[in-house]
């Protein structure tokens, strides 16, 4: 069964900068990736970026740069303008769509104990169902 992993890390040099890494483990080529925060897109979450392998990327503040890392993984850099660093408690969700297989989605957040610069382990937070 395909899976999606989500990893959130705080930059060591700049505590207001965060990076979300997402990857798809499974067969099929990715047609679209949607990244949201505050929950899944369509379920109260806010869209941060949409990445298409051929047509490029579209992003919305506070997303700074969305890019493909491999054919099945992406990264999204975020700039936190607020002093209170709200990203630390935020859930980030990534949805990978593969045709004709379908979509897989998972969410993750920065672990409370994580030190700046240390990446969170890729442990997806299941939403609604374990295979979502």
């Amino acid at each position: 069964t395909p899976e999606v992993w989500v990893q959130v890390q705080m930059e060591a040099t700049e505590l207001s900068s965060f990076t979300v890494h997402c990857g798809f483990l499974g067969p099929g080529s990715i047609s679209l990736v949607t990244v949201s925060w505050g929950g899944p897109d369509g379920a109260g979450g806010t869209k941060l970026a949409v990445l298409h392998p051929e047509l490029g990327t579209r992003q919305w503040a506070p997303a700074r740069q969305a890019r493909w890392e491999t054919q099945s993984s992406i990264s999204l850099a975020l700039e936190d303008s607020g002093a209170s660093s709200p990203f630390a408690n935020t859930t980030f969700c990534c949805k990978f769509a593969s045709f004709p297989e379908g979509s897989w989605e998972s969410c993750g957040s920065l672990p409370p104990s994580s030190d700046p610069g240390l990446s969170a382990p890729p442990t997806p937070v299941p939403i609604l169902r374990a295979d979502l």
Partner: antibody, heavy 120, light 107 residues
């Protein structure tokens, strides 16, 4: 204007074969996933077969696996459905449809359909 | 495969009425739901994608809502030209599956 025109349907004997074609125009055919959807006499819609833009992946409805083959010729802007060992339950109106990545793979354009009738 | 149960099968309404059609998925389909309109003698046409987004040229009297397993499609102020069969469809997991359709008739 996006246009999808199906052809190749007709009356065929039980166990016979047919090849449906769908001529696409008005868009970059090679960039889109395509599928064949049929509408049964009871007006139910079923996704019969689908193929992605780069021809890497295909999907078939369980009841047509091993009998139907979906293919595409991106140079000719044409989608095909080779149907063999036809059964009476394959009688339907067959549509070709385009899938839009940015619309969650919704089928944003459909052809007018071509009718397939399997008789005993 | 995911079953999309659409209700009601038939609707008889007067012009100006508000119409609601529901679709229930047998498992979560996220927000990957589309709605189609099929007028007599025509092929289906896309109305809504990602549950609530109207396709190009679709009037704003058509709206959609829901997430996960329960979805609603509404026509505010039905017009005579809305006479058609309406289908929901999930594109979350292969095989994409359709609801059984709702035939809308105008009194």
């Amino acid at each position: 204007d996006v246009k999808l025109v199906e052809s190749g349907g007709g009356l065929v004997k039980l166990g016979g074969s047919l090849k449906l074609s769908c001529a696409a125009s008005g868009f970059t055919f090679s960039s889109y996933h395509m599928s064949w959807v049929r509408q049964t006499p009871e007006k139910r819609l079923e996704l019969v077969a689908a193929i992605n833009s780069n021809v890497i992946s295909t999907y078939y409805l369980d009841t047509v696996k091993g009998r139907f083959t979906i293919s595409r010729d991106n140079a000719k802007n044409t989608l095909y459905l080779q149907m063999s060992s036809l059964k009476s339950e394959d009688t339907a109106l067959y549509y070709c449809a385009r899938h839009e990545d940015y619309y969650g793979f919704a089928m944003d354009y459909w052809g007018q359909g071509t009718s397939v009738t399997v008789s005993s | 495969s995911i079953v999309m149960t659409q209700t009601p099968k038939f609707l008889l309404v007067s012009a100006g009425d508000r119409v609601t059609i529901t679709c229930k998925a047998s498992q979560s389909v996220s927000n990957d739901v589309a709605w189609y309109q099929q007028k007599p003698g025509q092929s289906p046409k896309l109305l809504m994608y990602y549950v609530s987004n109207r396709f190009t040229g679709v009037p704003d009297r058509f709206t959609g809502s829901g997430y996960g397993t329960d979805f609603t499609f509404t026509i505010n102020t039905v017009q005579a030209e809305d006479l058609a069969v309406y289908f929901c469809q999930q594109a979350y997991r292969s095989p994409w599956t359709f609801g059984g359709g709702t035939k809308l008739e105008i009194k």
